[in-house]
């Protein structure tokens, strides 16, 4: 299923993030998904 | 599924020192933040010291009550957190939990174990 | 150091109650986007648990009658329908800055 608003997909970690955590680890895989 | 376990609390003398550790398993330890926050008997939660990642040098963090007595680190390869305290006081007699997050909210938490320090 | 002011710091409801439980950061926790706050529960010896993250975002697990809003300085944990294993102590936490703080607390008893 698709991750929810608010968060992307994280193929390092295999699950769904919250965009919000961001902020602090800009550099995240998932970050390139959130608005 | 996710597990924190601590160890390591006690009963010391002010003055004296200890060492907790935490061995984490369920999740990709190397990956995430780690924690201590602390709870004083019957009062409330006081975070301790942060430890991040490889990729951050490792940076440390500490509250102020603790800056310069207490030094957190870790080991990936043995998916483990310590906390090593020096110069202990009354003050610091505590419940310690150590907790892993990836940024921001406390995901996951251990048992806690128990630090008395008293003459 | 951002503090945190929770209140009331204990409380006592029925089964049933609709519980709010607000907490107030001496400064703004929040971006246009997102806010940093952190709900958890803790029951008497074990360990805190997270319920909410960013204000809002109910964590995996946790029943839906718990919500959480807010932005800025001020914020809400609501309790739709206090049930039995809901009595409990429910901490505020911020991850703006460090240091991380975490309010005083609110104890929920049995009325």
């Known amino acids: 299923a698709p991750c929810s608003r608010g968060s992307s997909w994280s193929a390092d970690l295999d699950k769904c993030m919250d965009c919000a955590s961001c902020r602090a680890r800009p550099h995240s895989d998932f970050c390139l998904g959130c608005a | 599924q996710v597990e924190l376990v601590e160890s390591g609390g006690g009963l010391v003398q002010p003055g004296g020192s200890l060492r907790l550790s935490c061995a984490a398993s369920?999740?990709?330890?190397?990956?995430?933040?780690m924690s201590w926050v602390r709870q004083a008997p019957g009062k409330g939660l006081e975070w301790v010291a942060e430890i991040r990642l490889k990729s951050d040098n490792y940076a440390t963090h500490y509250a102020e009550s603790v800056k310069g007595r207490f030094t957190i680190s870790r080991d990936d390869s043995k998916n483990s957190l310590y906390l090593q305290m020096n110069s202990l006081r009354a003050e610091d007699t505590a419940v310690y939990y150590c907790t892993g997050y990836y940024a921001d909210a406390m995901d996951y938490w251990g048992q806690g174990t128990l630090v008395t320090v008293s003459s | 150091d951002i503090q945190m002011t929770q209140s009331p710091s204990s409380l006592s409801a029925s089964v049933g109650d609709r519980v709010t439980i607000t907490c107030r950061a001496s400064?703004?926790?929040?971006?246009?986007?997102?806010?940093?706050m952190h709900w958890y529960q803790q029951k008497p010896g074990k360990a805190p648990k997270l319920l909410i993250k960013?204000?809002?975002n109910l964590e995996s697990g946790v029943p839906s009658r718990f919500s959480g809003s807010g932005s800025g300085t001020d914020f809400t944990l609501t309790i739709s329908s206090l049930q039995p294993e809901d009595f409990a102590t429910y901490y505020c936490q911020h991850s703006w800055e460090i240091p991380y703080t975490f309010g005083g607390g609110t104890k929920v008893e049995i009325k």
């Open positions: 369920g999740f990709t330890f190397s990956s995430y933040w």
């Open positions: 960013y204000a809002s």
């Open positions: 400064q703004s926790v929040s971006t246009s986007s997102y806010s940093y």
